[in-house]
Interface confidence: low
């Protein structure tokens, strides 16, 4: 690492990966092991994240830039910077204060996160269902009905209101 | 990076009333709820009620549902707040805050700057 | 609503000493409680979660106990940066509600 001085402001010249040093008459040393500084001019480095327990290391710290967590087989990230990881549900399910549950009749979630939303309610554009629902997929909306021929019919069930349970806070 | 945005300081005469906007960038708008929360001056926090960009679904604190109107524009990424009828006890910043969709576990990760509301005839 | 009664409402202590802040709900919230902190012109920022869950990024030394009515923010050793207002958060049902707050001073 080169150890620059500079007339003016001696610390301008430390480069990230550096900081500059008062101990040591405003040099620039080099990050300390499990440090970083991502920008120039730092009088501090930054202690890498360290990815514990239900995390797990995406990218590795550098004496540039932080660790990056994600989280282990099973659970997703939440939060800035994946600062909490939350278990993973089955589509067809929501993650609720009992744990995973089945999305109930009308509601559908694809994801292995999130919860259960409405089916659409096709009629609400003035189509049919073309292919109903499940927990895991939406419904599929055709043709309206006066498209379609003599004969055939479709049901459109109402899309349940949201419990408030539903919310975050 | 994920950033909310409020807008500017409001001096407003009682009865009166405001609306604040909350831009977010830098995340998917639509996938997070916006919670709007308060604090008077020198008061503790308060949660007024919460919107789900997707589809526009709320919920209300009841102290508020009758003066509160929470909405977004997904086009510009923007959550607002209406408070109408105001009074001199709604003086405070408002601050908005994003939480992720679950229930479950949810904490205010991401705020805005806050935005001082003033009521004063 | 559930009430959320934080106590002291403020305190004073040393560099180095341990602090303790209590939040009592009117009703059992299982463990469905949050503390922030709050430094002066600033948003609040998330500690712990779930009351005894250390989000990531935040030090060892703040850690949460309880469950049911009853729940503790306690930092074991008190550091200048430390000098907030401390709230805790209770998120079982809606509306979310928030204790009164604690301001934490240096002795």
């Known amino acids: 690492f080169e150890r620059t001085r500079s007339l003016q402001d001696p610390c301008s010249n430390c480069p990230a990966g550096t900081f500059c040093d008062n101990n040591r008459n405003q040099i620039c040393s080099p990050c300390p092991p499990n440090s970083f500084s991502s920008a120039g001019g730092q009088r501090t480095c930054d202690i890498c994240r360290q990815c514990k327990g239900v995390f797990r290391t995406r990218k590795e710290c550098s004496s540039t830039s932080n660790a990056e967590c994600d989280c282990t087989p099973g659970f997703h990230c939440l939060g800035a910077g994946c600062s909490m990881c939350e278990q993973d549900c089955k589509q067809g399910q929501e993650l609720t204060k009992k744990g995973c549950k089945d999305c109930c009749f009308g509601t559908f979630n694809d994801q292995k996160r999130g919860i259960c939303r409405p089916w659409t309610n096709c009629s609400l554009d003035g189509k049919s269902v073309l292919v109903n629902g499940t927990k895991e997929r939406d419904v599929v909306c055709g043709p309206s009905p006066a498209d379609l021929s003599p004969g055939a019919s479709s049901v459109t069930p109402p899309a349940p209101a949201r419990e408030p349970g539903h919310s975050p806070q | 990076q994920v950033q909310l945005v409020q807008s500017g300081a409001e001096v407003k005469k009682p009865g009166s009333s405001v609306k604040l906007s909350c831009k977010a960038s830098?995340?998917?708008?639509?996938?997070?709820?916006i919670n709007w929360v308060r604090q008077a001056p020198g008061q503790g926090l308060e949660w007024i009620g919460n919107i789900y960009p997707s589809d526009s679904y709320t919920n209300y604190n009841q102290k508020f549902k009758d003066r509160a109107t929470l909405t977004v524009d997904k086009s510009t990424s923007t959550a607002y707040m209406e408070l109408s009828s105001l009074r001199s006890e709604d003086t405070a910043v408002y601050y908005c805050?994003?939480?992720?969709?679950?229930?479950?576990?949810?904490?205010?990760?991401?705020w805005g700057q806050g935005t001082l509301v003033t009521v004063s005839s | 609503d559930i009430q959320m009664t934080q106590s002291p409402s403020s305190l004073s202590a040393s560099l180095g000493e341990r602090v303790t802040i209590t939040c009592k709900a009117s009703q059992d919230i299982n463990s469905y409680l949050s503390w922030y902190q709050q430094k002066p012109g600033k948003a609040p920022k998330t500690l712990i979660y779930?009351?005894?869950r250390l989000v990531d990024g935040v030090p060892s030394r703040f850690s949460g106990s309880g469950s049911g009515q009853d729940f503790t923010l306690t930092i074991s050793s008190l550091q200048p940066e430390d000098i907030a207002t401390y709230y805790c958060l209770q998120y079982d049902e809606l509306p979310p509600t928030f204790g009164g707050g604690t301001k934490v001073e240096i002795k």
């Open positions: 830098g995340y998917t708008f639509s996938s997070y709820w």
């Open positions: 779930r009351a005894n």
């Open positions: 805050t994003r939480t992720w969709e679950f229930y479950y576990d949810s904490v205010f990760d991401y």
